[in-house]
């Protein structure tokens, strides 16, 4: 399944919007830094693009869920957040077509499911962290930076798989 050329552009726009959303300096939040244990290997050990796409879809779905809570709405600029939703929604649509098209073509569907579970657990850790930090501005800034990093890593891995093929 070939993703539209606009998908890569959408990923870049998503990262750009995440960068623009920054409200405070991460340096003022050093005491709140946290290792969320991004499951990078779940994007790197899937040898076929068809196996990575559902995992990337899950990643974007979870980002969408995280930023569409009422606590998130209170933390970020509404206009930027709306643009961010639009970008994520478009990417989910692109990937969904490939997920449906790729059903049954993966080498080990249960490996893919374990990867999806690993992504869900990663976001559970992020949600728990925000809750424990009472959704403070610094906690949200740490999470924003983390999502930028993990989203960038996962899309880069997806791109490198695409270029290999």
């Amino acid at each position: 399944c070939d993703l539209p050329q606009t998908h890569s552009l959408g990923s870049r726009r998503t990262l750009m919007l995440l960068a623009q959303m920054r409200r405070i300096s991460l340096f003022s939040c050093l005491k709140d830094r946290h290792d969320f244990g991004f499951p990078q290997e779940e994007f790197g050990n899937q040898f076929q693009k068809a196996e990575t796409i559902p995992v990337l879809h899950e990643m974007i779905q979870q980002i969408f869920n995280l930023f569409s809570t009422k606590d998130s709405s209170a933390a970020w600029d509404e206009t930027l957040l709306d643009k961010f939703y639009t970008e994520l929604y478009q990417q989910l649509n692109d990937l969904e077509a490939c997920v449906i098209q790729g059903v049954g073509v993966t080498e080990t569907p249960l490996m893919k499911e374990d990867s999806i579970l690993a992504v869900r657990k990663y976001f559970q850790r992020i949600t728990l962290y925000l809750k424990e930090k009472k959704y403070s501005p610094c906690a949200w800034e740490v999470v924003r930076a983390e999502i930028m990093r993990s989203f960038s890593l996962s899309t880069n891995l997806q791109e490198s798989l695409r270029s290999k093929e």
Epitope: N45, Q46, F47, Q48, E51, Q61, E107, T108, P109, L110, M111, E113, D114, I116, L117, R120, K121, Q124
Partner: antibody
Framework: HVKLQQSGAELVKPGASVKLSCTAS????????IHWVKQRPEQGLEWIGR????????KYDPNFQGKATITADTSSNTAYLQLSSPTSEGTAVYYC??????????WGQGTTVTV | DIELTQSPATLSVTAGEKVTMSCKSS????????????LTWYQQKPGQPPKLLIY???TRESGVPDRFTGSGYGTDFTLTISSVQAEDLAVYYC?????????FGAGTKLEIK
């Protein structure tokens, strides 16, 4: 503490349908996959199918396609198995199991269905 | 569909003995991407639901005694109990965790003499 609580035993007339429930506590079903497994008296285990409660996507063993329907309600943290028009072959213990980490790592206590 | 053949059907042993049971798959359960074998072992004691023992052919589930060891690669797998205890009386099932539909072996019944 992770637990899967299944509904009570069912006595069903052949041809009638029955809906079994599996309620999770200690975790969100939308963060996992829920499987259903059948075990006839003194027999082995047969996989029926599974659901990803986060999106409702299901997979079934071809032998159960059309005879069993798996659904989930994330608001009540419950998964369901509906058996339509069962025959005497449907007499069995039905287990729900969740894939929280790897494989089917948590199991319900089982529901006995007698047709 | 992947077929799993377990042997023997029944094992009758004395407490303290070492036992091995076999599970053979009709096709390879090895994933080339992560080099893991997608075979799982479950233990089912009388009147209880199955319990996960081993996943990825050799990884012991947390809380499972270290007398249980899973081994094997590709199509041939083994579950070993180094020193059988009375509480190990159960049926042991292997399961294809590689592809849908998921399939189970017919089971090996462990009896204690």
């Amino acid at each position: 503490h992770v637990k899967l609580q299944q509904s009570g035993a069912e006595l069903v007339k052949p041809g009638a349908s029955v809906k079994l429930s599996c309620t999770a506590s200690g975790f969100n079903i939308k963060d996992t996959f829920i499987h259903w497994v059948k075990q006839r008296p003194e027999q082995g285990l047969e996989w029926i199918g599974r659901i990803d409660p986060a999106n409702g996507y299901t997979k079934y063993d071809p032998n159960f396609q059309g005879k069993a329907t798996i659904t989930a309600d994330t608001s009540s943290n419950t998964a369901y198995l509906q058996l339509s028009s069962p025959t005497s072959e449907g007499t069995a213990v039905y287990y729900c199991a969740s894939r929280v980490d790897y494989a089917m790592d948590y199991w319900g206590q089982g529901t006995t269905v007698t047709v | 569909d992947i077929e799993l053949t377990q042997s023997p059907a029944t094992l009758s042993v004395t407490a303290g003995e070492k036992v091995t049971m076999s599970c053979k798959s009709s096709q390879s359960l090895l994933n080339s991407g992560n080099q893991k074998n997608y075979l799982t072992w479950y233990q089912q004691k009388p009147g209880q639901p199955p319990k996960l023992l081993i996943y990825w052919a050799s990884t012991r589930e947390s809380g499972v005694p270290d007398r249980f060891t899973g081994s094997g690669y590709g199509t041939d797998f083994t579950l070993t109990i180094s020193s059988v205890q009375a509480e190990d009386l159960a049926v042991y099932y292997c399961q294809n965790d590689y592809s849908y539909p998921l399939t189970f072996g017919a089971g090996t019944k462990l009896e204690i003499k």
